[in-house]
């Protein structure tokens, strides 16, 4: 675009030079050249001369019109036809830029992840402005009536240390750009509801070579939360379905899950945890990747089978990922598993 | 109480600078986003410049690559410095606490005259 020029004359844009994508626009050009008569006045959009609605208004002005301006930036400039001179002569020249009001942020939700040192919160914007929209974070505590302002564009990452004078408070975002402001709705925020454990990692599997292979999942997180709840999501690598195990976790020592798996395939597994009676889920952890050893015994069993004596019923989800870049968007389908009850051992046995 | 004391504006002409400030007090300046708005003659007020705790900014457009805003919590003081300044940024200029809004808390401003 156009940063700075020296003119020759004046340049203005009606409505303005920032307005509301699809609105009627008139350009204006007045020239004020020394020595020059113009016998034609030209305009010019990104460079390209325009032949079309141009009206000659006086002997300095003339004017370019166009119908539902729809093009998010351009650069427009106009030129003179001096007598007696090869070239045009430039006269001024601007940017315009064109877009849409913010739609009030939704979705918005703020969280702490655990050791971050930060609250990070995050919204939808909407539909593309096309023109610069700031977005204003208002954290006003509900117990000091105290607010805090932050600007951000996309999302924001508050510091704790600046909201140790209160564990409640209010939280909205604003959006603002040249052609309007919205308001979100407000968020009620309880500082000790909203962390996520530190991240949990899968760091190992192994397959037994018994006669009834099982595959234990080895995995930990550096969590100092007591109590965890966790969903473990597997499945094998040819197929679309995942399986989901729920369960308690102690992270005081490494998580040990057992799966009786079909022998000689290829599995992921995911985990994810939050603190237990709180809405705010880790993302799911990395994939990992295990390969069941082949079958040894003569029974073929089944994903579901357990070898446990004293079962419960626990309900499981199955889900079905609707595309490989959105793992978390699924579809729930309802499956029955069954949680063993090991007698002894101080780790979490789940069959 | 919260206290805004503006000062620095002048009578300076088209193309010329000037640094406005505003002493604050009453409040933990570090932790308060800040904000400039200004009143030509015979106008309404109009929102100009804001700034965060972090010094994250935001500008209005007729203002924008012009004016700068800042703050030094060390000395609790906001700043706006106003170059290449036009006859039309003739108007009294105020701060207020906040980002954003065409609002002041009733202090007493600072005069910018833009002329020639």
């Known amino acids: 675009g156009i940063t700075s020029i020296n003119c020759s004359g004046d340049m203005w844009v009606e409505p303005g030079e920032i307005f509301q994508m699809g609105m009627n626009v008139s350009i204006y050009c007045q020239e004020a050249l020394k020595h020059c008569r113009p016998r034609n006045l030209y305009f010019y959009k990104n460079g390209f001369k325009e032949e079309f609605d141009i009206t000659r208004i006086n002997r300095t002005t003339a004017r370019i019109w166009y119908k539902g301006f729809s093009e998010p930036h351009a650069y427009m400039h106009c030129t003179a036809e001096c007598p007696g001179h090869f070239q045009e002569t430039l006269i001024c020249g601007k940017d315009i830029s064109s877009g849409h009001p913010p739609d009030a942020p939704s979705n918005l939700t703020c969280v702490i992840y655990e050791y971050s040192g930060n609250m990070t919160c995050t919204w939808n914007t909407g539909k593309p402005t096309y023109i610069d929209t700031k977005y204003i974070v208002h954290v006003k505590s509900l117990e000091t009536e105290e607010e805090q302002q932050y600007l951000a564009s996309s999302y924001v990452k508050i510091s704790t240390d600046s909201l140790q004078g209160s564990r409640k408070y209010l939280v909205w975002v604003q959006a603002v750009n040249s052609l309007g402001m919205e308001n979100s709705q407000q968020l009620h925020v309880h500082l000790d509801d909203i962390v996520i454990p530190s991240a949990s990692i899968i760091s190992r599997a192994e397959t037994t070579n018994d006669t009834v292979p099982k595959t234990i999942v080895y995995w930990k997180s550096k969590t100092m939360i007591e109590k965890v709840f966790c969903e473990m999501r597997y499945k094998t690598t040819t197929n679309q379905t995942w399986s989901v195990k729920e369960f308690d976790a102690n992270f005081t020592y490494v998580q040990q899950s057992e799966f009786y798996l079909e022998p000689d395939s290829k599995y992921v597994f995911q985990v994810r945890c939050q603190e237990t009676g709180k809405r705010n889920w880790q993302p799911w952890s990395s994939p990992f990747v295990h390969q069941t050893s082949q079958e040894t015994g003569k029974r073929n069993w089944q994903p579901w089978s357990s070898p446990f004596v004293h079962q419960t019923s626990q309900t499981v989800s199955q889900v079905t990922a609707k595309s490989s870049h959105e793992p978390q968007k699924m579809e729930m389908l309802s499956a029955t598993i069954f949680r063993g009850h090991p007698a002894s051992g101080n780790h979490q046995d789940i069959g | 109480q919260v206290q805004l004391q503006e000062s620095g504006g002048g009578l300076v002409q088209p193309g010329g600078s000037l640094r406005l400030s505003c002493a604050a007090s009453?409040?933990?300046?570090?932790?308060?986003?800040m904000r400039w708005v200004r009143q030509a003659p015979g106008k309404g007020l109009e929102w100009v410049s804001g700034i965060d705790s972090r010094g994250s900014t935001i500008y209005a457009d007729s203002v924008e690559g012009r004016f700068t805003i800042s703050k030094d919590n060390a000395k609790n003081t906001l700043y706006l410095q106003l170059n290449s300044l036009k006859t039309e940024d003739t108007a009294m200029y105020y701060c207020?606490?906040?980002?954003?809004?065409?609002?002041?808390?009733g202090s007493q401003g600072t005069q910018v005259t833009v002329s020639s």
């Open positions: 009453g409040f933990t300046f570090r932790l308060s986003a």
């Open positions: 207020a606490q906040g980002v954003y809004g065409d609002t002041y808390s």
